[in-house]
Amino acid sequence: QDPWAAEPRAACGPSSCYALFPRRRTFLEAWRACRELGGDLATPRTPEEAQRVDSLVGAGPASRLLWIGLQRQARQCQLQRPLRGFTWTTGDQDTAFTNWAQPASGGPCPAQRCVALEASGEHRWLEGSCTLAVDGYLCQFGFEGACPALQDEAGQAGPAVYTTPFHLVSTEFEWLPFGSVAAVQCQAGRGASLLCVKQPEGGVGWSRAGPLCLGTGCSPDNGGCEHECVEEVDGHVSCRCTEGFRLAADGRSCEDPCAQAPCEQQCEPGGPQGYSCHCRLGFRPAEDDPHRCVDTDECQIAGVCQQMCVNYVGGFECYCSEGHELEADGISCSPAGAMGAQASQDLGDELLDDGEDEEDEDEAWKAFNGGWTEMPGILWMEPTQPPDFALAYRPSFPEDREPQIPYPEPTWPPPLSAPRVPYHSSVLSVTRPVVVSATHPTLPSAHQPPVIPATHPALSRDHQIPVIAANYPDLPSAYQPGILSVSHSAQPPAHQPPMISTKYPELFPAHQSPMFPDTRVAGTQTTTHLPGIPPNHAPLVTTLGAQLPPQAPDALVLRTQATQLPIIPTAQPSLTTTSRSPVSPAHQISVPAATQPAALPTLLPSQSPTNQTSPISPTHPHSKAPQIPREDGPSPKLALWLPSPAPTAAPTALGEAGLAEHSQRDDRWL
C-alpha cells in the first residue's frame, strides 16, 4: 500500500502507535494536528521505535518529507550532543537513536530549525525551516495497553474494520490501542461491534470474546433473525416472527403492528386488528375511544388511604393529619413518633414505570443534569469495581489539600516555559506539560466524539480531589480517548455511579446502562484511588471522548450531560494570581498555559528576579521545561490567560508589542 495515498495510516505496538498523515503542513501546524488527536509529533528515540517508523513510512519518494518532533531554537547548537541541541517536542533531549543525514558541521546556527524525515531510503533526518509546509507528518500516540487484532473467522463477510481513538479507520492493524472499536460483519447477517477496554482482572482486551460469526446456521446470533430462526435442509436459515408480528422486507427483522397503532399508552400485538390497546396503572380506557386512556381517580376507591388522599394524573398519594405519620405501606397512619422514618409512596413513579421506548430514554438523557437514579444491579460490572479507563499516569495527592503545581525559580530561563517531566518510553505523554483542561465537554454531535464526564457528589472542600489523567494532555476534551473526568455535584446514595445510556447490544444487556464509577463513596468521604506521582508532575483534569466509527454496526452511543470545571489558567511560568474570580479558593489552581486556548490575554509587568512584587513562590527550583512551539518575541512577557470556548484554539503568545506585532505565519515557539 502506497503510504502517500490520500488516507493516513498507522502502525501500532502494544503501548504506542505511529500514524502517517500525508498532509502538507508547517511544523507548527503538524504539531497542533497531532496534539488535537491526543498525540504528539513522532519521537523515535530507540532503534526499535525507528524500525516501526521505517515500516510505516515504507519506500516513499525521495522528494517527500515528514515532520517528526524535533526542533531547535536559534543559536542553540550543541554539536557534540546526539541531538545537536535539538529538543523533542515532549520537552527533553533523551534519545538512544539518531539518524542525521549529515555529520554535524560547526556553524553558528543563526536560525530556528525543525527536523523532517526523508520518505525514501533510510529515512534520514534533515533539518530545515520550520515554516516550510512539507509533505506530511508523523504522529505518535501513547497508551497503557492494546488489544491484538481479531482473528478472521470462517463466517465473516470481510476483515474487521478498526477505528482508533485518533480517528484512523483501517483493516490493517496488528494492535489496537485502548479505546479502539472493531466492527465485524458476518455472512449470516448482522455483525458485531467490539470495544478495546480495560479488563476487570487487569490489562486490556476486547469487550466480547469470539467467535463472533459461527457459520450459516441458527446458532450464531440466532441466524440474524429477530424472532425465530429455522434451519432449512440445505443448511441455510429462514426467519419467522412470533404471533402478532410479521416478517419485514429484509427477511430477518419482524414488524410490530403496534408501531403504527393509535394506542395512546400501551399496545399489545394480536387480536383481530393485529393489536390491542391497554392503559397503564392509574389509567383506564376512555369509554368513547378505547385507544385513549383517562386518569383513574383512585381517591374515589373506598379505603384507598386511611386518612387523606390526593389524586393526580397517573397516581395518587396518601397523607396523614397533623400528629400522625404515614407508615411504610404508604396507606396507613400512626401517631407521630411511633415509627422511625416517614415514608410515602408514589405510584406514578414506582408502580407505573413500565419502561418507555428508546426515544423516550433519549429525551430523558437530554434533560439529565447530573441527577442520580436508583438502578437494579447491572450485570455488566460491579459498581464498586470500576472499569479503569487506562489512565497511563495518574498522580496521587493527599485528600485534605489541593494539588500543588510546580513553580519555576525566579532566575529560571527561558521566561515562557513549563515544568519538564522525566521521559517514560512506554508513555509518551507524561513528558508533556500537564494542564488543567479549560475546555468544557459538550453533548455528542455528528462531528464530535462523545464525552463521558462522571458527575460526582458534592463534598466538603477537604475531600475535593480532581481525578488526574496524563494519557493525552493539552488537547480539547472532546478528542481525549479513554479517560473519565470528575466534577463534584449533588450527593447521591452510597455506591451510586453515574448512569450512561447506551444502545450497544454487543456489549451490555438490553436496556441496561453500563456503569463508569471512578470513586468509591462512603458516607460523605470520597476516596479516589490513584498511584503515586513524582513531585514535578502537575495535575491534569480531563474528560473522555471515545471516537467510534460512523459505519460500525450496533455503534455504541454514549449520552451525557456536559460538565464544567472552573479554573484559573495562567501563562508559563505558573503564577498564583490575586485577581478576583468567581471560583472558590479550593478550586483556584495555577496551571501552565502553554496549551490553553488563547483568549483575552492580559499582560503582566515583567518581573526581575531580585524585585518580585507578584506572589510567585518557587517550590521546585530545579524543574525543567518542555519546549513548546511558541512565537518568539524579542523579550516575551508573562501573560494571564483566561479560558476560551474555542476547543481547538492553538496556543498563542505575546511579544514585546503585544498582539499588534503578532505575525500571520510564524514558526517560532509558542
Epitope: 522528494s63 526523508e118 515554516t131
Partner: antibody
Framework: QVQLVQSGPEVKKPGASVKLSCKAS????????IHWMRQAPGQRLEWMGY????????TYNQKFKGRVTITLDTSASTAYMELNSLRSEDTAVYYC?????????????????WGQGTLVTVSS | DIQLTQSPKFMSTSVGDKVTITCRAS??????VAWYQQKPGKAPKLLIY???NRYTGVPSRFSGSGSGTEFTLTISSLQPEDFANYFC??????????FGQGTKLEIK
C-alpha cells in the same frame, strides 16, 4: 551532471495553445519535483505549477488554473507544460526547474537546477 | 500572496567592492528564502538556500543572512564574473513561490 534542456522558442497567435518540454538527465527523474515559472519582459519571475514524477501529483497557481496543464513522459524523463487560450500578456520566457530535496543535511525547497528557458511570443 | 521587495533595483559598483542587496517580505517567511544569480540569456543559478546556507560550489564571498521579513545577500569582494542580475525567492507557503523583482549589478 544534472541538466534540464527545454524545447525551442515558439510564436503563437492569441487563442492558440503551446506545449513546452523539459528533458531531465543526470539524476533519477522520479526523485525530484519539476516546477514551471515564467518571466515576462521587465517583470519578476512568476510560479505556474509543479508536477511530482513519483506519482503525477500536480498543483497549479490559481492565476493559471484551467489554462495550464503539466504532464510527464516518465520513460523519456520529460516534463511538459501546456498553456491554452494564449493572450499577448503570455509573452514571456518559460523556465522549468528542479526543486531540491536536501543539501548537506538540510531540506529545502529552493530550485537547484533550471532549464535554459523557452521564449514564447504571442502575437497576432 | 507574500510580496518580496528587493533594493536597490540597480547598483553600479567596482571589482573588489562589498555589495549588500536586501529583500523584504510582506509577512514572516521564517528562513524559507533563496538567492539566485542570473546572467542575460542564461538560466538562474542557486547561490543561497534557507536564508543563510551557501549552495554547493558557490564561492565563499557570497553569504546570506536574515529571518522573518528582512534578508540580505552580501558579496564581500566583487569579482568580474559577479556582474549579473540577483533575485530572492520565498517558499514558506510552498508551492506558491514568489520572487523579488531583481537587482542588476553593473560595472561602474
Amino acid at each position: 551532471q544534472v541538466q534540464l534542456v527545454q524545447s525551442g522558442p515558439e510564436v503563437k497567435k492569441p487563442g492558440a495553445s503551446v506545449k513546452l518540454s523539459c528533458k531531465a538527465s543526470g539524476y533519477t527523474f522520479t526523485d525530484y519535483v519539476i516546477h514551471w515559472m515564467r518571466q515576462a519582459p521587465g517583470q519578476r519571475l512568476e510560479w505556474m505549477g509543479y508536477i511530482n514524477p513519483y506519482d503525477d501529483d500536480t498543483t497549479y497557481n490559481q492565476k493559471f488554473k484551467g489554462r495550464v496543464t503539466i504532464t510527464l513522459d516518465t520513460s523519456a524523463s520529460t516534463a511538459y507544460m501546456e498553456l491554452n487560450s494564449l493572450r499577448s500578456e503570455d509573452t514571456a520566457v518559460y523556465y522549468c526547474a528542479r526543486r531540491g530535496n536536501s543539501y548537506d543535511g538540510y531540506f529545502d525547497y529552493s530550485m537547484d537546477y533550471w532549464g535554459q528557458g523557452t521564449l514564447v511570443t504571442v502575437s497576432s | 500572496d507574500i510580496q518580496l521587495t528587493q533594493s536597490p533595483k540597480f547598483m553600479s559598483t567596482s571589482v573588489g567592492d562589498k555589495v549588500t542587496i536586501t529583500c523584504r517580505a510582506s509577512q514572516n517567511v521564517g528562513t524559507a528564502v533563496a538567492w539566485y544569480q542570473q546572467k542575460p540569456g542564461k538560466a538562474p543559478k542557486l547561490l543561497i538556500y534557507s536564508a543563510s546556507n551557501r549552495y554547493t560550489g558557490v564561492p565563499s564571498r557570497f553569504s546570506g543572512s536574515g529571518s522573518g521579513t528582512e534578508f540580505t545577500l552580501t558579496i564581500s569582494s566583487l569579482q568580474p564574473e559577479d556582474f549579473a542580475n540577483y533575485f530572492c525567492q520565498q517558499y514558506t507557503n510552498y508551492p506558491m513561490y514568489t520572487f523579488g523583482q531583481g537587482t542588476k549589478l553593473e560595472i561602474k
